[in-house]
Amino acid sequence: TVPPMVNVTRSEASEGNITVTCRASSFYPRNIILTWRQDGVSLSHDTQQWGDVLPDGNGTYQTWVATRICRGEAQRFTCYMEHSGNHSTHPVPS
C-alpha cells in the first residue's frame, strides 16, 4: 500500500467565488474516496466534479475533486480522503 499525497488548492472563479480542488496522487491501490465536506457533512454529489482515477506512470494513481464556493466561506469546507483504511481531512488554504 502506498498512501496518497493530498494537496488542496484554490483559484479564482466568477466574482466572489473560488474553485477549490483537492488532488490525491502517488497512491496504490487505486480504490480511494475523495470528497468535499461542508459544515462537517457530505457536500452533495451534484455540486462536486471528480476526475478519473488515472495511472501516474510510477505504478501508482492520481485523481481530484473540485467544487465552487463563496470566497468568504472557505473555512467551512474540508477535503476528506480515505484510502486503505486510513483517513485524513484537508482544509482550504488561506
Epitope: I33, R37, D39, G40, V41, S42, G72, E73, Q75, R76, F77, T78, Y80, E82, G85, H87, T89, P91
Partner: antibody, heavy 119, light 107 residues
Framework: DVQLQESGPGLVKPSQSLSLTCTVT?????????WNWIRQFPRNKLEWMGY???????NYNPSLKSRISITRDTSKNQFFLQLISVTTEDTATYYC????????????WGQGTLVTVSA | DIQMTQSPASLSASVGETVTITCRAS??????LAWYQQKQGKSPQLLVY???MLADGVPSRFSASGSGTQYSLKINSLQPEDFGSYYC?????????FGAGTKVEIK
C-alpha cells in the same frame, strides 16, 4: 482546551420560552467551528437541535425550526438557545458542544443543564 | 432524515468479556459515523469518528467497523470503567441524528 458551560433556569412553565446560555472558554467562537445545542430527553434519547457557526450562520433541526433560535454575544464569547412555546415534551438535559469542519462529530460537551417544563 | 437503529437496547456482560454493539442507518451514510460513551449523570464522550477512527485517549480494546448502512462497535476484554451507555451518530447530512443507545450493564 475548549471548555463549555451551560447555564439557565431549571424550571420553565408550559407555553413560555426556554432560554439557555453556553459560555465558551479557551477558544473564540468567532475563530472557527460550529457551536451546537443538543438535548437528551428523560429516557435518554439524544436530539441535535442546531448550531451557530463562527461567522454567525445558523442551521436548525427542521423538527424545531419554527420554535428555535440560536444567537451569540461575541464580546462575552457566549452563544444562546431560545425555544418558544415549550411543552412538557421539552423537558430534557440541554448540552452545548461544538464540532470542527473536518466532520460533524462532537469532541467535547458541556456538563449539561436539566430543564423541567412544568406548571 | 436518516434514522439510526441501535441494537441491542441493553446487554449484561462480565468483566473480561467481548461485547459488540451495532448501529443501522436508514440510508447509506458512507462511514460518516461517530460513537459516544456516556456514564450515568455525565456528558457523552467521543469514542470513534469516521466510523473506525479512535478518538484521542480511547483505549485500544475499543474497535469499530462497518460501511454503507451497517456499523459496529466492539469492546474486547470489558473493563469496569466501560459500563454505561453507548450511542451512534451519523453526520452524512442534516439533521444529525443519534441512535437510541445501548446500555451495557454488569452481569
Amino acid at each position: 482546551d475548549v471548555q463549555l458551560q451551560e447555564s439557565g433556569p431549571g424550571l420553565v412553565k408550559p407555553s413560555q420560552s426556554l432560554s439557555l446560555t453556553c459560555t465558551v472558554t479557551g477558544y473564540s467562537i468567532t475563530s472557527d467551528y460550529a457551536w451546537n445545542w443538543i438535548r437528551q430527553f428523560p429516557r435518554n434519547k439524544l436530539e441535535w437541535m442546531g448550531y451557530i457557526n463562527y461567522s454567525g450562520t445558523t442551521n436548525y433541526n427542521p423538527s424545531l425550526k419554527s420554535r428555535i433560535s440560536i444567537t451569540r454575544d461575541t464580546s462575552k464569547n457566549q452563544f444562546f438557545l431560545q425555544l418558544i412555546s415549550v411543552t412538557t415534551e421539552d423537558t430534557a438535559t440541554y448540552y452545548c458542544s461544538y464540532y470542527r469542519y473536518d466532520g460533524a462529530w462532537f469532541p467535547y460537551w458541556g456538563q449539561g443543564t436539566l430543564v423541567t417544563v412544568s406548571a | 432524515d436518516i434514522q439510526m437503529t441501535q441494537s441491542p437496547a441493553s446487554l449484561s456482560a462480565s468483566v473480561g468479556e467481548t461485547v459488540t454493539i451495532t448501529c443501522r442507518a436508514s440510508g447509506n451514510i458512507h462511514n460518516y459515523l461517530a460513537w459516544y460513551q456516556q456514564k450515568q449523570g455525565k456528558s457523552p464522550q467521543l469514542l470513534v469518528y469516521n466510523a473506525i477512527m479512535l478518538a484521542d485517549g480511547v483505549p485500544s480494546r475499543f474497535s469499530a467497523s462497518g460501511s454503507g448502512t451497517q456499523y459496529s462497535l466492539k469492546i474486547n476484554s470489558l473493563q469496569p470503567e466501560d459500563f454505561g451507555s453507548y450511542y451512534c451518530q451519523h453526520f452524512w447530512s442534516f439533521p444529525l441524528t443519534f441512535g437510541a443507545g445501548t446500555k451495557v450493564e454488569i452481569k
